[in-house]
């Protein structure tokens, strides 16, 4: 279920844009980072893919949004929501949030000024 979003700008417009992009590379990139860099990711579908490759694919996808800058927070919130139930300890959730907030900078976008990554219902 999709939560209400849109601290900045037209939330319905951002929601449509976030829906249209493929956030899987971003999710995979962040999961790889919090699990620690290794020579090979045996449990990943593209075995030779390194975190940096996923990062580039992630940045490319985020760039597909018409208003990347304005809708960045909504995209980050959706990634958080998608992965929330996978994270079963408090430190890992904090680590995931930190990596998520670093994402715009890694992609050479401006970080959203205010972006609440706490998923509704207190799940993350």
């Amino acid at each position: 279920m999709r939560r209400e979003r849109g601290r900045q700008g037209d939330s319905s417009s951002c929601e449509r844009q976030v829906d249209r992009v493929n956030l899987k590379p971003c999710e995979q990139h962040i999961m790889q980072r919090i699990m620690g860099e290794q020579e090979q990711y045996d449990s990943y579908d593209i075995r030779s893919t390194r975190s940096s490759d996923q990062q580039q694919r992630c940045c490319d996808e985020l760039n597909e949004m018409e208003n990347t800058q304005r809708c960045m927070c909504e995209a980050l919130q959706q990634i958080m929501e998608n992965q929330c139930d996978r994270l079963q300890d408090r430190q890992m959730v904090q680590q995931f949030k930190r990596e998520l907030m670093n994402l715009p900078q890694q992609c050479n976008f401006r970080a959203p000024q205010r972006c609440d990554l706490d998923v509704s219902g207190g799940r993350c």
């Epitope: 899987k24 995979q28 998608n82 079963q88 300890d89 408090r90 207190g122 799940r123």
Partner: antibody, heavy 118, light 111 residues
Framework: QVQLVESGGLVVQPGGSLRLSCEAS????????MHWVRQSPQKGLEWVSL????????EYADSVKGRFTISRDNSKNSLYLQMNTLRADDSAFYFC???????????WGQGTLVTVSS | DVVMTQSPLSLPVTPGEPASISCRSS???????????LDWYLQKPGQSPQLLIY???KRASGVPDRFSGSGSGTDFTLKISRVEAEDVGVYYC????????FGPGTKVDIK
């Protein structure tokens, strides 16, 4: 090292209630999701319930939903399972289990035996 | 519900020889985040289960490197490169993609 010690297992009649406890040590208890898993010769290993580190979210197997309640007291490093309307097929060893952080079970207690019989 | 099956259900082994256990799920265990949610546990006689392999292929802390996990989608394998006497017990696979479901177990004993 991580230690999980279960208690409270007894012989109880069908329809009865029981409360299991698990005392945890050797790790920061209030950082981790905790689970109950049971094991019987009939059903093998069966996940029962989980509770997030702060108690904000609980989940149950369909077979125990509405009858069992998981809870925790982080100030006491303790996990609980309140079992009501017990049935014969609830008879099993009940293990207290720590989540490793990504939905795998990295530490198990020694188990406590629950027998539901008239 | 995701149903887990294992084969063989019983595996007599010779110390020093390799051994392999197969686990199959009724649906793919690959999440959108790229991780396969499949773990392996060993329950030695009279003991609680212990984690061997998590997320498809990652060896748990303290687990000897003779144990390895592989596979993708619905088919997974646990390999022991050289079986030792202490490896006897029941091996279980478990999926954690949707809630948690264990396989029926594979009993490994010495021939």
């Amino acid at each position: 090292q991580v230690q999980l010690v279960e208690s409270g297992g007894l012989v109880v009649q069908p329809g009865g209630s029981l409360r299991l406890s698990c005392e945890a040590s050797g790790f920061t208890f209030d950082d981790y999701t905790m689970h109950w898993v049971r094991q019987s010769p009939q059903k093998g290993l069966e996940w029962v319930s989980l509770i997030r580190w702060d108690g904000s979210r609980t989940e149950y197997a369909d077979s125990v939903k509405g009858r069992f309640t998981i809870s925790r007291d982080n100030s006491k490093n303790s996990l609980y399972l309140q079992m009501n309307t017990l049935r014969a097929d609830d008879s099993a060893f009940y293990f207290c289990v720590k989540d490793g952080g990504l939905r795998y079970f990295d530490s198990w207690g020694q188990g406590t035996l629950v027998t539901v019989s008239s | 519900d995701v149903v887990m099956t294992q084969s063989p259900l019983s595996l007599p082994v010779t110390p020093g020889e390799p051994a392999s256990i197969s686990c199959r799920s009724s649906q793919s265990l690959l999440h959108s985040n790229g991780i396969h949610y499949l773990d392996w546990y060993l329950q030695k006689p009279g003991q609680s289960p212990q984690l061997l392999i998590y997320l498809g292929s990652k060896r748990a802390s303290g687990v000897p490197d003779r144990f390895s996990g592989s596979g993708s989608g619905t088919d997974f394998t646990l390999k022991i490169s050289r079986v030792e006497a202490e490896d006897v017990g029941v091996y279980y696979c478990m999926q954690s993609l949707q809630t948690f479901t264990f396989g029926p177990g594979t009993k490994v004993d010495i021939k």
